[in-house]
């Protein structure tokens, strides 16, 4: 079935931009200018996942690239990383578990819960350059608030 | 505060071509998505469309082809083109905000403009 | 394309009474349904969405609940000013959303 998706860009609530850090990674840091133009561009589509009032499920793909955002264990600890996928076969209305993240709304600040992982949020630190991570609390030093903006093409 | 005005809505024949605006104020077309609903008199709503970034946009299946939602993010504007005008496509348009990235219900709305297609 | 279907079309009530009206989804549609309220004239107002959840400012007489393909609106006690017509809709992020026929609450 067709999945509805959009394409945007992400910052959090410190106005660091996602950039690409190495085939498999995102970092977070201050851009400008001309700059703006190496952040990460999302696909962000809506997915079939578990209800509530306040979440509604999305996978996170990089724009034009066969890569998502997914959520795995390693060495025990819930961690982020970018999947590679068959094109073919995604956005897909019922993505891995592992691809879905709870997005929640609030004051136009946008949360990004896993769903494989209740409770860990995308998160970035407050120093620059450092990369995107999965992260167990919210409210203290790192950062899991993010705003949206569409891209135009 | 949330504004949406819409305008552009009038008398055109059959066959013909409209294009309706909608300005928005209090919030900005660069994070919200906007649909655009339609009510013929007498009748109950029918969604035409919904418009994300400019690159995706998502129709009712009667819609494709006829109409074309699209926006201009520095003037705050949102439109819709209409082609092929039939009778049948004289209602009051509705422009209206998504609440939330893909919520899918609408909580702001305009006060309507009215498209009367005949000859 | 999912068709909601609302019952009953038109509903005569008076002033205090406990009124419902339901919509029914052609197929699942979760939680994903909200409600409106439009008064001639008038845009819709959103009242309730995700099934249950009241929008902001709406009333606490109004409630939703529901879920899969059959969902009630229930006004516990009808006020004058709530005479209006109500629509039902499919919302989420879907690729096509739909609107019931409508249900005109009018005056017995």
């Known amino acids: 079935a067709p999945v509805r998706s959009l394409n945007c860009t992400l910052r959090d609530s410190q106005q660091k931009s996602l950039v690409m850090s190495g085939p498999y990674e995102l970092k977070a840091l201050h851009l400008q200018g001309q700059d703006m133009e190496q952040q990460v561009v999302f696909s962000m589509s809506f997915v079939q996942g578990e209800e509530s009032n306040d979440k509604i499920p999305v996978a996170l793909g990089l724009k034009e690239k066969n890569l998502y955002l997914s959520c795995v264990l390693k060495d025990d600890k819930p961690t982020l990383q970018l999947e590679s996928v068959d094109p073919k076969n995604y956005p897909k209305k019922k993505m891995e578990k592992r691809f879905v993240f709870n997005k929640i709304e609030i004051n136009n600040k946008l949360e990004f819960e896993s769903a494989q992982f209740p409770n860990w949020y995308i998160s970035t630190s407050q120093a620059e350059n450092m990369p995107v991570f999965l992260g167990g609390t919210k409210g203290g030093q790192d950062i899991t608030d993010f705003t949206m903006q569409f891209v135009s093409s | 505060e949330v504004q949406l005005v819409e305008s552009g809505g009038g008398l055109v024949q059959p066959g013909g071509s409209l294009r309706l605006s909608c300005t928005v104020s209090g919030f900005s077309l660069s994070s919200y998505a906007m649909s655009w609903v339609r009510q013929a008199p007498g009748k109950g709503l029918e969604w035409i469309g919904i418009?994300?970034?400019?690159?995706?946009?998502y129709y009712a299946s009667w819609a494709k082809g006829r109409f074309t939602i699209s926006k201009d993010t520095s003037k705050n504007t949102l439109y819709l083109q209409m082609n092929s005008l039939r009778a049948e496509d004289t209602a009051v348009y509705f422009c209206?905000?998504?609440?939330?990235?893909?919520?899918?219900?609408?909580?702001?709305w305009g006060q309507g403009t009215t498209v009367t297609v005949s000859s | 394309d999912i068709v909601m279907t609302q019952s009953p079309s038109t509903l005569s009530a008076s002033v205090g009474d406990r009124v419902t009206i339901t919509c029914q989804a052609s197929q699942s549609i979760s939680s994903y349904l909200s409600w409106y309220q439009q008064k001639p004239g008038k845009a819709p107002k959103l009242l309730i969405y995700?099934?249950?959840t009241l929008a902001s400012g709406v009333p606490s007489r109004f409630s939703g609940s529901g879920s899969g393909t059959d969902f009630t609106l229930t006004i516990s006690s009808l006020q004058p000013e709530d005479f209006a017509t109500y629509y039902c809709q499919n919302a989420g992020g879907g690729i096509n959303i739909a609107f019931g026929q409508g249900t005109k609450v009018e005056i017995k």
């Open positions: 418009i994300y970034d400019s690159a995706s946009t």
């Open positions: 995700k099934a249950s």
């Open positions: 209206a905000r998504e609440r939330q990235i893909f919520s899918g219900d609408m909580d702001g």
